[in-house]
């Protein structure tokens, strides 16, 4: 069975084809080659001499037990080598010779017992080394690491490391890898020698499910003293053994580290009062809790130095009381509990993501809700009922506003967006909005993107509601049950490039409403009920139009509509997916492609 | 279609068939077997994925006695610092994991429950596997 040609001469997918040897019938020019799940078993010298251009080579689960000297010798352009799941027993000292451009080496689950004997010291270009899920017991970084000056990611998770000693990291003192991210999760740690990490600088350190008791966790964290880390991730996994106890003493040792960003990722423990727990983290710039259960978040001090707070997939007893002076970004998403939003005081806030929480808002939106006048980005999508009671007073800096799939109330009672003259992006898709007021978009003079799919209009008629949106480039009006539109609805949209009118209830097509759209490139009228044209004589669409989608409509392929069908044929160079433009009537022509029809009609006298 | 038996409990019998062409082997054990009236136990999965599990989600298509419920999307792995350790599993890496579950207080009517589980992962998204579970529910007379 041949390999699948994904990109001709470049990418070949040869997965699980029962190959016992490297195929020799692929082009020399091949750059990406997936040979995974083939029983190759043995890689001899110059195994890949036929593929000098290879950049990515996937040898996952190839039952490889032996890799000889120079197996990859010809692969001077190879940047990624994947060896996951091979039961390697014999790895020659020169196994990886010739890989002068290798940046990523994945040797997950390869029976590797030690880094010391791993022959990679010459791979100077290596950026990422993944040796997770192996049998490594010692964390001693061999001397050859001093050659790996580009190393950015070292994944040692799911190994057998129990202790870390001062000598293990000596090589990092000799050549500090300023950008190294280290993952030690799922190693059964019970001892970190104090001073082992003194004056070590890491970009990221991940320690999840490393400790089998609170005491071990405390002493190991104390052993990290002196570490300077940009991002520290602690926590557990839901499907692994979890700590039975967790209290405020757990993280006391963090006071002796220099941390820029902190994340606690999953904790199978109910946290009541978290203020003391994070005492040592009041001055990190970014603080993140993921999948943590917290009874109350009331006690964060206004003076905490956090600039970014992230609370994701957590459970709360009530919506947190957030009053933080320095906070610039707040991400509060996919959380449970506290279903009603309550006022926050975040005077420096510029970015606020409150999506996917099922929250209800008794009033929206005003600077008093968020305690800031600096907000530029606001995402309230996928929430509950949001009652529009104020037109964004004090929030005039907003540039991005997303309400999609929330239930907006009182949208047609006043000009909700009147203050938002800087807004560039607005999404009110699927918000149960019924447009019954022509001033709904007044004030949005800078708006470039408007998404309002899945809403409805009074009498299923699109009125002149876009008159002030002179900078609009993208407009989505799909799934709005529209049947008719004002001939002048789009007259002011001279910058519009994309217009989506799909999934509505239009029965006829008219070019007149689009005459002013001098920049229009894409017009989508798919999934309507278009049978014919509104007027006998259809004009041309704007000359800028490049794509016209009329698929899945109800074309009437009869003589009375001959001129319309001919007009469609004349637009052939604009039409997309023409094979999905089929006749709906009459019954004898149902399902036939519209463009293949040859309708010759005679006038019956 | 070969049917794979999972387990029997006092009020349910659980089995599955593959609903994809690939039919890559997957081993599923539930201990103790699920009782629909109330259950707490461990789900053990042994599997060698054909693609990375990063950004894994399930599409669930549930049928209750021939009535189709709306499709449900259950995100399992978001892509970074995920809840489950297997979210970091790579293509070809052994996934051998035990997940605890519990639910209570759900009253199910007698009958045949079908659940098609479409596992989708990676970027670009592709199907990892598809299993159709059948649960025959016979509520206890007591």
């Amino acid at each position: 069975e041949p390999c699948v040609e994904v990109v001709p001469n470049i990418t070949y997918q040869c997965m699980e084809l029962n190959f016992y040897k490297i195929p020799d019938n692929l082009p020399f020019s091949t750059k990406n080659l997936d040979l995974s799940f083939n029983p190759l078993r043995h890689l001899g010298s110059y195994s890949f001499f036929s593929f000098p251009e290879l950049q990515v080579l996937d040898l996952s689960r190839c039952e490889i037990q032996t890799i000889e000297d120079g197996a990859y010798q010809s692969l001077s352009h190879l940047s990624t080598l994947i060896l996951t799941g091979n039961p390697i027993q014999s790895l020659a000292l020169g196994a990886f010779s010739g890989l002068s451009s290798l940046q990523k080496l994945v040797a997950v689950e390869t029976n590797l017992a030690s880094l010391e004997n791993f022959p990679i010291g010459h791979l100077k270009t290596l950026k990422e080394l993944n040796v997770a899920h192996n049998l490594i017991q010692s964390f001693k970084l061999p001397e050859y690491f001093s050659n790996l000056t580009n190393l950015e990611h070292l994944d040692l998770s799911s190994n057998k490391i129990q202790s870390i000693y001062c000598t293990d990291l000596r090589v990092l003192h000799q050549m500090p890898l300023l950008n190294l991210s280290l993952d030690l999760s799922l190693n059964p740690m019970n001892f970190i020698q104090p001073g082992a990490f003194k004056e070590i600088r890491l970009h990221k350190l991940t320690l999840r499910n490393n400790f089998d008791s609170l005491n071990v966790m405390k002493t190991c964290i104390q052993g990290l003293a002196g570490l300077e880390v940009h991002r520290l991730v602690l926590g557990e996994f839901r499907n692994e053994g979890n700590l039975e106890k967790f209290d405020k003493s757990a993280l006391e040792g963090l006071c002796n580290l220099t941390i820029e960003e902190f994340r606690l990722a999953y904790l199978d423990y109910y946290l009541d009062d978290i203020i003391d727990l994070f005492n040592c983290l009041t001055n990190v710039s970014s603080f993140s809790l993921v999948s943590v259960t917290i009874e109350r978040v009331k006690d964060f001090s206004y003076n905490f130095g956090w600039q970014h707070l992230e609370l994701v997939n957590c459970k709360f007893g009530q919506f947190p009381t957030l009053k933080l002076k320095s906070l610039k970004r707040l991400t509060f998403t996919s959380n449970k509990g506290g279903n009603a939003f309550s006022e926050v005081d975040l005077p420096s806030l510029e970015f606020l993501d409150l999506s996917r929480n099922g929250l209800s808002f008794k009033g929206c939106c005003s600077q008093s809700d968020f305690g800031t006048t600096s907000l530029k980005y606001l995402d309230l999508s996928f929430n509950g009922v949001i009652t529009m009671s104020s037109n964004f007073l004090g929030l005039e800096q907003l540039e991005h506003l997303d309400f999609q799939h929330s239930n907006l109330k009182q949208m047609s009672e006043f000009s909700v967006f009147l203050s938002l003259r800087n807004l560039i992006y607005l999404d009110i898709s699927h918000t149960h909005t019924r447009v019954a007021f022509n001033g709904i978009f007044n004030g949005l003079s800078s708006l470039e993107v408007l998404k309002m799919a899945g809403n409805s209009f009074q009498e299923n008629f699109l009125p002149d509601i876009f008159t002030e949106l002179r900078n609009l480039t993208f407009l989505d009006l799909s799934q709005c049950q529209l049947e008719q539109l004002s001939p002048t609805a789009f007259n002011s949209l001279s910058s519009l490039q994309v217009l989506n009118m799909s999934h509505n209830n239009f029965f006829s097509l008219d070019t007149f409403p689009y005459k002013c759209l001098n920049s229009l490139q894409v017009l989508d009228y798919s999934l309507n009920h278009i049978m014919t044209s509104k007027k006998q004589e259809l004009q041309h669409f704007p000359s800028s139009l490049a794509f016209l989608n009329l698929t899945q409509n109800d074309f009437a392929c009869t003589c009375e509509h001959q001129s319309f069908l001919q007009w469609i044929k004349d637009q052939r160079q604009l039409l997309v997916e023409v094979e999905r433009m089929e006749c709906a009537t009459p019954s004898d022509k149902q399902g036939m492609p519209v463009l293949s029809l040859n309708i010759t009609c005679q006038m019956n006298k | 279609q070969k049917q794979y038996w999972v387990c029997n409990s006092s009020d349910a019998s659980i089995s599955y068939t593959y609903c994809d062409k690939m039919q890559y082997p997957i081993s599923i054990n539930v201990n103790p077997c699920i009782e629909l009236k109330r259950s707490k136990g461990l789900l053990h999965i042994f599997y060698i994925p054909r693609r990375d599990l990063k950004q894994l989600y399930f599409n669930l298509y549930i049928t209750v006695n021939t009535m189709n419920l709306p499709k449900r999307k259950e995100v399992i792995c978001r892509g970074s610092d995920d809840d489950y350790s297997f979210c970091r599993a790579l293509k070809g890496e052994t996934v051998n994991t035990t997940i605890s579950f519990s639910f209570k207080g759900i009253k199910f009517s007698k009958g045949k429950y079908k659940c098609v589980v479409e596992a989708i992962s990676g970027s670009p998204e592709e199907m990892l596997f598809c299993l159709e579970f059948v649960i025959l529910h016979q509520p206890n007379s007591n």
């Epitope: 009062d273 203020i275 009331k298 006690d299 964060f300 001090s301 206004y302 003076n303 009381t321 009053k323 002076k325 006022e343 926050v344 005081d345 008794k362 009033g363 929206c364 005003s366 600077q367 008093s368 809700d369 968020f370 305690g371 009652t387 009671s389 104020s390 037109n391 007073l393 004090g394 | -």
Partner: antibody, heavy 118, light 107 residues
Framework: QVQLQESGPGLVKPSDTLSLTCAVS?????????WHWIRQPPGKGLEWMGY???????DFNPSLKTRITISRDTSKNQFSLKLSSVTAVDTAVYYC???????????WGQGTLVTVSS | EIVLTQSPDFQSVTPKEKVTITCRAS??????LHWYQQKPDQSPKLLIK???HAISGVPSRFSGSGSGTDFTLTINSLEAEDAATYYC?????????FGGGTKVEIK
């Protein structure tokens, strides 16, 4: 500049209903914030009574919940307090105020004294 | 509800002297505590929010400190115009509550 001004009768009979209005200038009461009533019996401390949010939502001190109503007239940009079944202990200076997201009160009316007496 | 206890109730102080007023909360309120000054026949005026943040326009001799349950308002060098009653107020949870007040008199 936000300004608040209380008005209403200075004398109310016991068991009657006390009614006060707070006229707001310099900011729309539907534009944001919550608008509160606070009282101070002669020679005593301050007691928070309740508020009306810019959305129209109201909440009250549990000690007054059965007797208090707060409403608004958006056309006049004012909000009102009604306290039913008053007794002598309700004699106080009544203040209206605007609360900040900090839950502090930077803006107050000048206060109006209401005496409950027959 | 959270009870705020102020002490002393009354203080008689000579000009230029330092004045210290304390406010104790019945439970931890982080730093969600504010201080007001009220002169006779006037409405209260906000001096300090979040325990230590001075409101603009308030003289620098007024400062606040504390967190949790114990808070202090300090007037560094008392002036005649500072004769007033000072109140603390918690913004930690509803119902919002005030302390009983401390009257500062000039000797």
């Amino acid at each position: 500049q936000v300004q608040l001004q209380e008005s209403g009768p200075g004398l109310v009979k016991p068991s009657d209903t006390l009614s006060l209005t707070c006229a707001v200038s310099g900011y729309s009461i539907t534009g944001g914030y919550s608008w509160h009533w606070i009282r101070q019996p002669p020679g005593k401390g301050l007691e928070w009574m309740g508020y009306i949010h810019y959305s129209g939502y109201t909440d009250f001190n549990p000690s007054l919940k059965t007797r208090i109503t707060i409403s608004r007239d958006t056309s006049k940009n004012q909000f009102s307090l009604k306290l039913s079944s008053v007794t002598a202990v309700d004699t106080a200076v009544y203040y209206c105020a605007r609360k900040d997201p900090s839950d502090a009160f930077p803006y107050w009316g000048q206060g109006t004294l209401v005496t409950v007496s027959s | 509800e959270i009870v705020l206890t102020q002490s002393p109730d009354f203080q008689s102080v000579t000009p230029k002297e330092k004045v210290t007023i304390t406010c104790r909360a019945s439970q931890s309120i982080s730093d969600h505590l504010h201080w007001y000054q009220q002169k006779p026949d006037q409405s209260p005026k906000l001096l300090i929010k979040y325990a230590s943040h001075a409101i603009s326009g308030v003289p620098s001799r007024f400062s606040g400190s504390g967190s949790g349950t114990d808070f202090t308002l300090t007037i560094n060098s008392l002036e005649a115009e500072d004769a007033a009653t000072y109140y603390c107020q918690q913004g930690h949870s509803f119902p919002l509550t005030f302390g009983g007040g401390t009257k500062v008199e000039i000797k």
